[in-house]
């Protein structure tokens, strides 16, 4: 994570800052939401455990044409050590439930804020 740069500030970014920036972006999405986020698109629910960042990206990357989450997708790619492309589900171990993108973002935000408060930045 110390090499995360490019989505907010130049050069290396401390892990705590990278996580903060992702949280801020998700907060902005939830607070600025007027119409249904991404036209109510559905994505696979994920287990918020190890490999969560890659799983989140694999789920969200299948939503196309939604500018509101493009920055989130870019940020998540900085947290995921491997390249993720649409239709790839290597980190999504369980694919049994689909939820709206708005709910996905809320769930992810709550979990990331808990990790931040606990000091778990990696």
């Amino acid at each position: 994570l110390t090499c995360l740069g490019g989505f907010a500030s130049p050069g290396p970014v401390p892990p705590s800052t990278a996580l903060r920036e992702l949280i801020e972006e998700l907060v902005n999405i939830t607070q600025n939401q007027k119409a249904p986020l991404c036209n109510g698109s559905m994505v696979w629910s994920i287990n918020l455990t190890a490999g969560m960042y890659c799983a989140a990206l694999e789920s969200l990357i299948n939503v196309s044409g939604c500018s509101a989450i493009e920055k989130t997708q870019r940020m998540l790619s900085g947290f995921c050590p491997h390249k993720v492309s649409a239709g790839q589900f290597s980190s999504l171990h369980v694919r049994d439930t689909k939820i709206e993108v708005a709910q996905f973002v809320k769930d992810l935000l709550l979990h990331l804020k808990k990790l931040f408060r606990e000091g778990q930045f990696n």
């Epitope: 804020k113 808990k114 408060r117």
Partner: antibody
Framework: EVTLKESGPVLVKPTETLTLTCTFS??????????VDWIRQPPGKALEWLAH???????RYNPALKSRLTISKDTSKSQVVLTMTNMDPVDTATYYC???????????????WGQGTTVTVSS | DIQMTQSPSSLSASVGDRVTITCRAS??????LNWYQRKPGKVVKLLIY???KLHSGVPSRFSGSGSGTDFTLTISSLQPEDVATYYC?????????FGGGTKVEIK
Amino acid sequence: EVTLKESGPVLVKPTETLTLTCTFSGFSLSTSDMGVDWIRQPPGKALEWLAHIWWDDVKRYNPALKSRLTISKDTSKSQVVLTMTNMDPVDTATYYCARTVSSGYIYYAMDYWGQGTTVTVSS
Amino acid sequence: DIQMTQSPSSLSASVGDRVTITCRASQDIRNYLNWYQRKPGKVVKLLIYYTSKLHSGVPSRFSGSGSGTDFTLTISSLQPEDVATYYCQQGNTLPLTFGGGTKVEIK
């Protein structure tokens, strides 16, 4: 109206354990995003953050004092308790509790404070 | 730990004056800077959070600015009730740290 009040001994002896209680009203520590912090200010010195506890029992401590501090909450009594072991004269200070809220961004801003309680460490 | 340096440590100004207090962080804290006011014999009050957001009930003569490492608290027109000590605090990284305070008096 949000209020917080600190209570505890005025005088403690060196090596003893200090127990401070923060009793609050106007909010609940069972409500999402709520937290309570402890801060102190020795005479003539800067404010120093000690610890905080969140509604979901996540606890964080100042690393410089972590081995001596324990923070806990009793939601039903609307109280947060801080214990500090092995007290020393340099721990003489006014101790404050304050509320913090993490809705939206996590600002770590303390929006309501107690009046403070002065603790003197002396034999 | 992030060191917070406030200046001046004290100042004296006339009613109606524009007063500026600065706070410098030893490293980048982005916009996570909060300002507090402690009046003699009163509880500490949050004035401004996240650099420039006014806490509820705070008069509009108070404002904050800055980013990164350098921040400013401004009182646009000093009032007698503004006599107090003002503290900055960084909320970016634990442990949370405070500036040494600025005591504001009326000439």
